[in-house]
């Protein structure tokens, strides 16, 4: 007997899609061998229609795909736009069609439902609204109008024009009689339930001259849309529930193994802890549609998701819903990168952000996830030279090391910097990753003075002390601007005396500014790197003032008590924070992240190439 397993029978209707899962023993050989779906011929052969090696028959062009999930030992064949011609016997299998590693599947596609002997068929999705129209003749215009539901052999009254409403329909049904010109009444049922499905009879009048009309109501559960995304990547659920629920609370929930649907996020402010820092529910449109973005996809995120609308913000019978089945592919194209980066107060972090290497020219962005309301992610920096005002001098986005990775450096860390940050581009929206910055106990490794004042026309020397742990690293000074940090010449002045228990491998590297001009004012960073991978940095603000007395200035660590110009960072931090714009293009329906940025955040410039390093700031 074959070890392959799958559905023996699949029944569907014209126009539908099917998703056929075939199971195989997940041995190393099986995981990597060819997977196929073929149609059995009358004389015993089996003609390949689609395979995992990229072949797609002309019969399936544009309407089928085959996806392998080696970690689960399954592959899935999706076939859309079914017709009755697709009915037949098929095999799903591994290896070569004629060998025995296969499973027989019978696919039967029947005609869709139509009108049956004067019965009007209403096919409506669960939770939506149906209007059943009932014509009548003039002689019954003044007579009682009613709607019955056939339960077994007996018709049960649902609603009538005298005000009766069956308790099963309370609060969600009404009977409308059109103006005198139209000989029609209609019954509107909202929040449709599966139990509402069945045969209905509407009637005008109660005697032998009454007008009757049959209706067949079919209530469909939404077919889950199949969504395949990569581990560590991102998914967007677009939820369009219709304008009738525009003002009702919205939710996204994930169905557990039972019938419960656990809320992932809703518009009432609820959010599941497992999605903290990696989910955004974007603002609703006027038509009631919204979308939810989840980044940093994990294996356990796979499953069935429902979005819906209900005043409770969770799934209830009668909620209009949309469904998705999310598969998370563990053979991901998105490389592993640390999900947590640690730094110390006053220190720095260097975050590596992956992007699709085919999109090296895309604009890179870094934003700070905020959990308030439904979540948002105001931009902090981009690769085109824009930096949010309160991050000037301490944040840089560098194109290095390139080839699928960019680097973000943040220094002068405070406890307020702890939180979740997203790396993204205006290209492939699936490549959105999340990193959490944690501020831990400890001292910064690099020691620099606090704010420094230089005198016009004189020479300024600024020291940076590197402990011995960085002996093998390249040490540098650079001047920060919106486009990165331009390297400056520096002098190695031998071992540093700033560290206890640190040997000759510690280093004092100084920055020298000769004949200081006004243009020298600004932020300077000293840091370490290995090739194109950046490590820790420390920042010093150099102010320039008029000459008071002659001479050159050396700055020592004694002046380093005050934190670097925290006034600049603090003033207006909360004020500007609240002006951050919810960027509509942070959602996958549009490729680009908007250029509409917080105008309060200062002028645009242009962020350049810089560099990157292992994740972890001053805590190594």
């Amino acid at each position: 007997k074959s070890p392959i397993f799958g559905p023996e029978e699949v029944n569907s209707v014209e126009g539908n899609s099917v998703s056929i899962t075939c199971y195989y023993p997940p041995t190393s050989v099986n995981r990597h061998t060819r997977k196929y779906w073929c149609r059995q011929g009358a004389r015993g052969g089996c003609i390949t229609l689609i395979s995992s090696e990229g072949y797609v028959s002309s019969k399936y062009a544009g309407r089928a795909n085959l996806t392998n999930f080696p970690e689960n030992g399954t592959f899935v064949v999706n076939i859309a736009q079914l017709s009755q011609d697709d009915s037949g016997r098929y095999k799903c299998g591994l290896g070569i069609n004629s060998r025995g590693l296969s499973f027989d599947v019978s696919l039967e596609v029947s005609q869709g439902p139509g009108l049956l002997n004067d019965t009007k068929v209403y096919t409506v999705d669960l939770g939506r609204t149906v209007t059943i129209n009932c014509p009548f003749k003039t002689e019954n215009a003044q007579k009682r109008k009613s709607l019955y539901k056939q339960i077994g052999l007996y018709p049960v009254l649902v609603i009538d024009s005298s005000g009766y409403v069956n308790p099963n329909y309370t609060g969600r049904i009404r009977l409308d009689i059109q103006g005198t010109g139209q000989l029609l009444f209609s019954v509107v049922i909202n929040q449709l339930r599966l139990s509402d499905a069945g045969q209905y009879l509407c009637q005008a009048g109660d005697d032998s001259n009454s007008n009757k009309k049959n209706a067949d109501l079919q209530v469909l559960k939404p077919e889950p849309e199949l969504v395949y995304e990569d581990l560590r990547g991102s998914v967007t659920f677009h939820c369009a529930l219709g304008p009738e629920v525009a003002n009702v609370a919205k939710f996204l929930c994930r169905q557990s193994s039972g019938e419960n649907c656990d809320v992932v996020v809703n518009t009432l402010g609820k959010r599941a802890p497992a999605f903290e820092g990696r989910i955004l529910l974007n603002p609703q449109d006027k038509d009631g549609s919204f979308s939810v973005v989840i980044t940093g996809l994990r294996k356990e995120d796979a499953g069935r998701y429902l979005c819906g609308a209900h005043s409770d913000g969770q799934l209830q019978e009668g909620s209009p819903i949309q469904a998705w089945q999310l598969f998370v592919n563990e053979e991901s194209t998105i490389p592993r990168s640390p999900t947590v980066v640690k730094g110390v107060a006053g220190g720095s972090v260097a975050v590596l952000c992956p992007y699709n290497r085919k999109e090296s020219k895309s604009i890179k962005y870094w934003c700070l996830w905020e959990g308030a309301q439904n979540g948002r992610c105001p931009l902090l920096v981009d690769s085109e030279g824009w930096v949010k005002a309160q991050y000037e001098g301490r944040l840089s986005l560098l194109e290095e090391p390139g080839n699928g990775t960019f680097t973000v450096i943040l220094n002068q860390l405070t406890s307020r910097d702890a939180g979740f940050y997203w790396c993204l581009t205006n290209g492939d929206t699936l490549w959105r990753t999340t990193v959490e910055i944690k501020i831990i106990e400890g001292e910064p490794n690099l020691k620099v003075p606090g704010n420094v004042t230089a005198v016009l026309g004189e020479t300024l020397k600024v020291p940076c002390h590197f402990p011995c742990k960085f002996s093998s690293y390249e040490k540098y000074w650079c001047k920060w601007n919106n486009t990165g940090c331009q390297a400056l010449p520096s002098q190695d002045e031998g071992p540093s005396k700033a560290f206890v228990n640190c040997d000759e491998n510690s280093r004092l590297v100084s920055l020298t500014l000769n004949l200081v001009t006004r243009a020298d004012e600004g932020w300077y960073w000293c840091g370490v790197k290995q090739g194109h991978f950046y490590g820790e940095t420390a920042a010093v603000y150099v102010a320039v003032e008029e000459r008071k007395a002659a001479g050159s200035r050396d700055v020592s660590l004694a002046k380093a008590d005050a934190a670097p110009d925290e006034k600049v960072l603090d003033s207006g931090f909360r004020e500007i924070e609240n002006k951050a714009i919810q960027d509509p293009r942070l959602f996958a329906e549009e490729k680009a992240v908007a250029d509409t940025r917080d105008q309060a955040d200062g002028s645009r410039a242009s962020v350049d190439s810089g560099s990157s390093e292992e994740q972890g700031g001053s805590s190594r």
């Epitope: 559905p7 209707v13 539908n16 099917v18 199971y23 599966l194 559960k221 169905q255 193994s257 039972g258």
Partner: nanobody
Framework: EVQLVESGGGLVQAGDSLRLSCAAS????????MGWFRQAPGKDREFVAT??????????YYADPVKGRFTISRDNAKNTVYLQMNSLKPEDTAVYYC?????????????????WGQGTLVTVSS
Amino acid sequence: EVQLVESGGGLVQAGDSLRLSCAASGRTFTTYVMGWFRQAPGKDREFVATITWSGSTNYKYYADPVKGRFTISRDNAKNTVYLQMNSLKPEDTAVYYCTSSTVVTDPRKLNEYAYWGQGTLVTVSS
């Protein structure tokens, strides 16, 4: 919660037929999977057949020993699943359990099903 009630079990002769029914009630509007497992005396519970659905599409899965003899079907309006058992054999003797869930990644695995009925006994004498 979902309640499942099986019926239709009994004593039959080898070669006879039997039809089991399972009626679901309660929070069935998120049920997309219903199936049958069985447990013979002194043995582990084993997969028999499962039907999963999505809109108007049904998928039917069967265990090898019952292929070609058993047929699973459902009546959506009645929230009921049926197991038509033909050409019964003495080795089909077991307690048959109805089960349901929202979604299963592998229909053969009993731990993936959230709800179980009390079971109905089928005895096939030779």
